[in-house]
């Protein structure tokens, strides 16, 4: 058993049929010695008396808010949560496996630049009695500070018969060094509590590996005289690191109709302009990627050919 | 070239060669990007490689003030990785595929280090740790980790030379 926060404790249980469970001793936070009784949740049934209460925690029915009273007055609470371990593996029932970029990916994180600011998100089908708490650091043995905000519900989607809820959190490295080569990864830890179930999820990454620039901005077209060709120009996204002579991007320019199966014109460039062939009912799209490190491409920025 | 007197390197040449290094480092093992090698107990391996750190003057301001500190750090790293790529980690079993770009990568690391340091001038170089894994699978894992680390190192070096070529070239 360990303390998650004040008056909230996590009991780690090996979860299998007829498991013996864990013996837990609760102590009432009071100077009083006599006349103390214990109850669980809303029940008035007295579970025991005395300053300490010893219980065998085996299942969710044994978890909950234990309260010690004296003469009708509440003295203190202890909330017990369960953390299940099945076949040596901690349960992951609360969050959905996003399966990208690999199986058992529960947390996904992205950064728009090298400033040390990043966003992580996760998915669940649970809509109520759900809380998250996020901590992060650079490195684990001698951790350097990363400050995370509160996790918030950022999107709701309908997936078949189920509703899916996306939560996200923004974090900022306290002393970021955008130009340096990272040697220690960022660690992100998410505590998830659903009713009386506790789970924790972690992710470890370098900012450079989670970079995904915003799409290029201000796409403009200039038809070339006596030609089917069009000069398309764009700018670096505002959110990208500066100076651009140091933090350079490379671009992919594509002309395509509405369907992905349609024919296309495609060209790669390090410049902020390119010449392509525009077709009626097609769009010109441009996306960006770090020029020197193969992290994710941005989403496309598009303008219609006409 | 970065010479003892502290004159400028051939920024544009360094830029071209460092960009080539980036391409080669990724083609040497593109799938490295999809392997979570941190799960495999990194500390004893890649913590020994030289990293371009915050105080090394490789940021735009540091380069403007005095690029020599940064260039020396990059040179150290190039020599370090060049030696690693020539060591039995890469030459031993399992043999690299004949079409592996590691050979080109090795030659390009040497080429860029020579651009930075001409004959007769020697910056101190970092000692290569004795990383001699006994098992072929350990060697394979070590290669992945070294290449992964090299990808990050050459990316910073390429940024430095691109910025130098754009803003510091005479």
């Amino acid at each position: 058993i360990w303390e998650l926060k004040k008056d909230v404790y996590v009991v780690e249980l090996d979860w299998y049929p007829d498991a013996p469970g864990e013996m837990v001793v609760l102590t009432c936070d009071t100077p009083e010695e006599d006349g103390i009784t214990w109850t669980l949740d809303q029940s008035s049934e007295v579970l025991g008396s005395g300053k300490t209460l010893t219980i065998q925690v085996k299942e969710f029915g044994d978890a909950g808010q234990y309260t010690c009273h004296k003469g009708g007055e509440v003295l203190s609470h202890s909330l017990l949560l369960l953390h299940k371990k099945e076949d040596g593996i901690w349960s992951t029932d609360i969050l959905k496996d996003q399966k990208e970029p690999k199986n058992k990916t529960f947390l996904r994180c992205e950064a728009k630049n090298y400033s040390g600011r990043f966003t992580c998100w996760w998915l669940t089908t649970i809509s109520t009695d759900l809380t998250f708490s996020v901590k992060s650091s650079r490195g684990s043995s001698d951790p350097q500070g990363v400050t995370c905000g509160a996790a918030t519900l950022s999107a709701e989607r309908v997936r078949g018969d189920n509703k899916e809820y996306e939560y996200s959190v923004e974090c900022q490295e306290d002393s970021a060094c955008p130009a340096a080569e990272e040697s220690l990864p960022i660690e992100v830890m998410v505590d998830a509590v659903h009713k009386l179930k506790y789970e924790n999820y972690t992710s470890s990454f370098f900012i450079r590996d989670i970079i995904k620039p915003d799409p290029p901005k201000n796409l403009q077209l200039k038809p070339l005289k006596n030609s089917r060709q069009v000069e398309v120009s764009w700018e670096y996204p505002d959110t990208w690191s500066t100076p651009h002579s140091y933090f350079s991007l490379t671009f992919c320019v594509q002309v395509q109709g509405k369907s992905k199966r349609e024919k296309k014109d495609r060209v790669f460039t390090d410049k902020t302009s390119a010449t392509v062939i525009c077709r009626k009912n097609a769009s010109i799209s441009v996306r960006a990627q770090d020029r020197y490190y193969s992290s994710s491409w941005s989403e496309w920025a598009s303008v219609p050919c006409s | 070239r970065a010479v003892p007197g502290g004159s400028s390197p051939a920024w544009t040449q360094c830029q071209q060669l460092s960009q080539k290094l980036c391409t080669l480092a990724w083609s040497a093992h593109p799938l490295v990007g999809h392997m979570d090698l941190r799960e495999e107990g990194d500390e004893e391996t890649t913590n020994d490689v030289p990293h371009i750190q915050c105080g090394d003057g490789c940021d735009p301001q540091g380069l403007r003030d005095n690029s020599q500190f940064c260039l020396q750090r990059i040179h150290q790293g190039l020599i370090f990785y060049e030696k690693l790529l020539g060591s039995d980690i890469f030459t031993g079993e399992p043999s690299l595929l004949p079409d592996s770009p590691v050979g080109q990568l090795h030659a390009s690391l040497l080429g860029l280090s020579q651009l930075l340091q001409p004959e007769g001038h020697h910056w101190e170089t970092q000692q290569i740790p004795s990383l001699s894994p006994s098992q072929p699978w350990q060697r394979l894992l070590l290669r992945f980790k070294i290449l992964r680390s090299l990808q990050a190192f050459v990316a910073v070096a390429a940024r430095v030379f691109a910025h130098g070529a754009a803003t510091l070239s005479p």
Epitope: Q229, K263, R266, V267, D270, K280 | -
Partner: antibody, heavy 118, light 107 residues
Framework: QVQLVQSGAEVKKPGASVKVSCKAS????????LHWVRQAPGRGLEWMGW????????EYAPKFQGRVTMTTDTSTSTAYMELRSLRSDDTAVYYC???????????WGQGTMVTVSS | EIVMTQSPATLSVSPGERATLSCRAS??????LHWYQQKPGQAPRLLIY???QSTSGIPARFSGSGSGTEFTLTISSLQSEDFAVYYC?????????FGGGTKVEIK
């Protein structure tokens, strides 16, 4: 599968014109760009231009501008390349090729030998 | 127009050996570079597109790398059917241009 079958060899006199055909099969004709590339005997490859069968748009290499015309007939899924004012250095194998991507050549015809000789 | 230069013009290699073919562009073309193989009396066939992407059905011994102005086609272990002429082609800008070719012959 995608296939391009070209017309047979031609012998022409200098100053004449030649029209080479290229019949496509195995795909929707308007879904691919069509290019023409030529190769003089013992020489390298030379791009001549492209046509979009969907709308008839064309782009020709400056070297051939004014001397070449590329057309298509969607009813027969056939592309044509006409080269006028032939000279002896136009002697070459002329290839048509098709791709969904505009700028490189995935599927090639077998080639048509055009000999220009007086 | 962009001039593509291939080297060497002829490469003599023994079967089973590695062949490295070079292609240089007269200006930076990012990764807009494609490789073709042509055997005598046949049309060329696409091997590699956008510098390093392998065409489906092409043996894994063919690989491409490079960006900017310098590109390489590597054939790791030459088989008898690989002796042919290899062309690079740039697609950075029109007109599309080819290199002069590298003939890979049996040593």
């Amino acid at each position: 599968q995608v296939q391009l079958v070209q017309s047979g060899a031609e012998v022409k006199k200098p100053g004449a014109s030649v029209k080479v055909s290229c019949k496509a099969s195995g795909y929707a004709f308007t879904d691919y760009y069509l290019h023409w590339v030529r190769q003089a005997p013992g020489r390298g490859l030379e791009w001549m231009g492209w046509i979009d069968p969907e709308n008839g748009d064309t782009e020709y290499a400056p070297k051939f501008q004014g001397r070449v015309t590329m057309t298509t007939d969607t009813s027969t899924s056939t592309a044509y390349m006409e080269l006028r004012s032939l000279r002896s250095d136009d002697t070459a194998v002329y290839y048509c090729n098709a791709n969904k991507e505009l700028r490189y050549f995935d599927v090639w015809g077998q080639g048509t030998m055009v000999t220009v000789s007086s | 127009e962009i001039v593509m230069t291939q080297s060497p013009a002829t490469l003599s290699v023994s079967p089973g050996e590695r062949a490295t073919l070079s292609c240089r562009a007269s200006q930076s073309i990012s990764i807009n570079l494609h490789w073709y193989q042509q055997k005598p009396g046949q049309a060329p066939r696409l091997l590699i597109y956008f510098a390093s992407q392998s065409t489906s059905g092409i043996p894994a011994r063919f690989s491409g790398s490079g960006s900017g102005t310098e590109f390489t086609l590597t054939i790791s272990s030459l088989q008898s059917e690989d002796f042919a002429v290899y062309y690079c082609q740039q697609s950075n800008s029109f007109p599309l241009t080819f290199g002069g070719g590298t003939k890979v012959e049996i040593k």
